[in-house]
Interface confidence: medium
């Protein structure tokens, strides 16, 4: 077990803070909830603290919760590939470019680390080149979320990882909006981290609303499990 992994044996409180600017529309979001890495489970609620969110909530899911991939459940035989927990408590910087097909792009930078016993994800997001009447600024996405695989590989030069995946957002007219994600994570501290073999995270997310909440908000339940690396040969012969 890595030193960082020991911090995730129980339920951990999570705080998310985002400042965003998309085509000049500035906004802020606060999120709170908890994560349980034993089950790969995240429960979070987000509110837009500046009024109405200028972009659809589903376009921010990867920035919020795929941002705290330290809560992914890594099976016993894959624990030596869990970069995310090994970087804790000092944490990691997570940078992404998200290209929305035939539309604009988000660039995000986040610092994910422990502050006290709370896991904090502080994010800056800049979005440019979006069409005012497109699927994103035109709010044409359905309020739901598909399952995805998130592919992880080591980046030995930067003592971190590179991550690629493609999100499929459902559009109200029945079509799909693709969002290509290019991600890199580098540790904040200078302690040892685990550099993984290639593998993937399998994610399932459910979006809902709080019937008592008047502010613009999103409630998120997510399960994430690491996969893609088989047991070693010695396991097969047990």
């Amino acid at each position: 077990m890595s030193k960082g992994e020991e911090l995730f044996t129980g339920v951990v409180p999570i705080l998310v803070e985002l400042d965003g600017d998309v085509n000049g529309h500035k906004f802020s979001v606060s999120g709170e909830g908890e994560g349980d890495a034993t089950y790969g489970k995240l429960t979070l609620k987000f509110i837009c603290t500046t009024g109405k969110l200028p972009v659809p909530w589903p376009t921010l899911v990867t920035t919020f919760s795929y941002g705290v991939q330290c809560f992914s459940r890594y099976p016993d035989h894959m624990k030596q590939h869990d970069f995310f927990k090994s970087a804790m408590p000092e944490g990691y910087v997570q940078e992404r470019t998200i290209f929305f097909k035939d539309d604009g792009n988000y660039k995000t930078r986040a610092e994910v680390k422990f502050e006290g016993d709370t896991l904090v994800n502080r994010i800056e997001l800049k979005g440019i080149d979006f069409k005012e009447d497109g699927n994103i600024l035109g709010h044409k996405l359905e309020y739901n979320y598909n399952s995805h695989n998130v592919y992880i590989m080591a980046d030995k030069q930067k003592n971190g990882i590179k991550v690629n995946f493609k999100i499929r957002h459902n559009i109200e007219d029945g079509s799909v909006q693709l969002a290509d994600h290019y991600q890199q994570n580098t540790p904040i501290g200078d302690g040892p981290v685990l550099l993984p073999d290639n593998h993937y995270l399998s994610t399932q997310s459910a979006l809902s609303k709080d019937p008592n909440e008047k502010r613009d908000h999103m409630v998120l339940l997510e399960f994430v499990t690491a996969a893609g690396i088989t047991h070693g040969m010695d396991e097969l012969y047990k």
């Epitope: 705080l15 709170e32 502050e115 006290g116 908000h217």
Partner: nanobody, 128 residues
Framework: VDQLQESGGGSVQAGEALRLSCVGS????????MAWFRQAPGKEREGVAA????????YYADSVKGRFTITRDNVKNTMYLQMPSLKPEDSAKYYC?????????????????????WGQGTQVTVSS
């Protein structure tokens, strides 16, 4: 927290409004859970409203639900209680409370939670 300081109390007529503020000093990192309590003479202290550290979760006592609004500004380390259309039964000394601990039962019942830090209180008097 070095100090919690309430302000904004006063004497008003029924139907008028007040906004209470509670400023915290002496902390820089994670913001605390916070709550407003009140105590009228000869009565027990009761919870009024509570708010989570990021302002995402809010809780209200049944007696003020739909009337009062709790908010916070984490840049200013300040919590607010907006109290429009006050009633004589809202008369009491209002206290703010704060707690930095995590992973407890705060969200189960924030009014029965054992808060670490308390202010000195501000008096609200509503006459008919």
């Amino acid at each position: 927290v070095d100090q919690l300081q309430e302000s904004g109390g006063g004497s008003v007529q029924a139907g008028e409004a007040l906004r209470l503020s509670c400023v915290g000093s002496g902390y820089t990192s994670i913001n605390p859970y916070m709550a407003w309590f009140r105590q009228a003479p000869g009565k027990e202290r009761e919870g009024v409203a509570a708010i989570s550290s990021g302002g995402v979760y809010t809780y209200y006592a049944d007696s003020v639900k739909g009337r009062f609004t709790i908010t916070r500004d984490n840049v200013k380390n300040t919590m607010y209680l907006q109290m429009p259309s006050l009633k004589p039964e809202d008369s009491a000394k209002y206290y703010c409370a704060a707690d930095f601990r995590r992973g407890g039962n705060w969200n189960v019942d924030p009014f029965r939670y054992d808060y670490q830090h308390w202010g000195q209180g501000t008096q609200v008097t509503v006459s008919s």
